[in-house]
């Protein structure tokens, strides 16, 4: 059976201040090394502890960076890619792709490029909603009779 | 998950030369970062070298520099450490080291904290 994964993708700015010890994660990716398959983008494998970026907490191991001070890093070396991290300065801007696993289930694994992945809380919470409403208004009908 | 097996240590003249290999699993081997340290008695362990995944860039401590050789064999999972010139201060145990990808900071920042996998150590004594 196919597990079905739903994903809530959300973009974020991050600024980050260089500590002492540099901004604190490491990288995977590029076009010459990549690491998630059908995908030369450059994301985040680790984050050191009590680094730059462990101590601000937005930035997540698996995050996806799409830009660096304004600079899109499609396309680029994995080297290419560490010297523009290496170089960015005392005060960096990511821009990061953040994906939440939203639920898993027994349907047929649909690509993260399909537009009908709609992450399964945006249903269920309207359908709750809306039973909530209709149960209160079934009280109310009752009370009235 | 990486495991790494250190190997080259031994007993060598003040002046000589001896080559480390360390020889890792793991599939993905050109994903991770390398590096050596050593601890001499008494000391922290300290860093000496490392290697990018690609092999395309490299980092050595000011004490080593000139004189040690950080390469990589990613056909054969190993990467080696050349050092020449050998001083009685050189002797220590010498560790390699793995963690996965590319750290965003340049060398001179390295310590133990920046990697997750290590080997069991080789001693290397200069006399």
């Known amino acids: 059976m196919n597990g079905r994964v739903d994903y809530l993708v959300t973009e974020e700015e991050i600024n980050l201040t260089r500590g002492p010890s540099g901004l604190g994660f490491n990288i995977v990716g590029g076009t010459d090394q990549q690491y998630v398959s059908n995908d030369s983008g450059i994301y985040v494998s680790r984050i050191k502890e009590n680094g730059a970026a462990a101590l601000d907490g937005r930035l997540q191991e698996g995050d996806k960076i799409l830009s660096v001070n304004g600079q899109d890093l499609k396309n680029l070396l994995h080297q290419d890619a560490v010297d523009l991290f290496r170089n960015a300065g005392y005060a960096v801007s990511l821009r990061v792709q953040h994906r939440l696993q939203v639920q898993n289930g027994p349907i047929g694994h649909r690509g993260e490029g399909d537009p009908s992945g709609i992450p399964i809380f945006m249903v269920l919470v309207p359908v709750f909603a809306l039973t909530m409403v209709a149960a209160w208004a079934f009280m109310r009908y009752r009370q009235q009779l | 998950q990486v495991q790494l097996v250190e190997s080259g240590g031994g007993l060598v003249q003040a002046g000589g030369s001896l080559r480390l290999s360390c020889a890792a699993s793991?599939?993905?081997?050109?994903?991770?970062?390398m590096g050596w340290f050593h601890q001499a008695p008494g000391k922290e362990c300290e860093f000496v070298a490392e290697?990018?995944?690609?092999?395309?860039?490299?980092g050595y401590a000011d004490s080593v520099k000139g004189r040690f050789t950080i390469s990589r064999d990613n056909a054969k999972n190993t990467v080696y450490l050349q050092m020449n010139s050998l001083k009685p201060e050189d002797t220590a145990v010498y560790y390699c080291?793995?963690?996965?990808?590319?750290?965003?900071?340049?060398?001179?920042?390295?310590?133990?904290?920046?990697?997750?996998?290590w080997g069991q150590g080789t001693q290397v004594t200069v006399s």
């Open positions: 080291a793995a963690v996965i990808g590319s750290p965003t900071d340049s060398s001179d920042y390295r310590s133990s904290l920046d990697y997750d996998y």
């Open positions: 793991g599939r993905t081997f050109s994903s991770y970062t």
């Open positions: 290697i990018s995944g690609t092999g395309g860039n490299t």
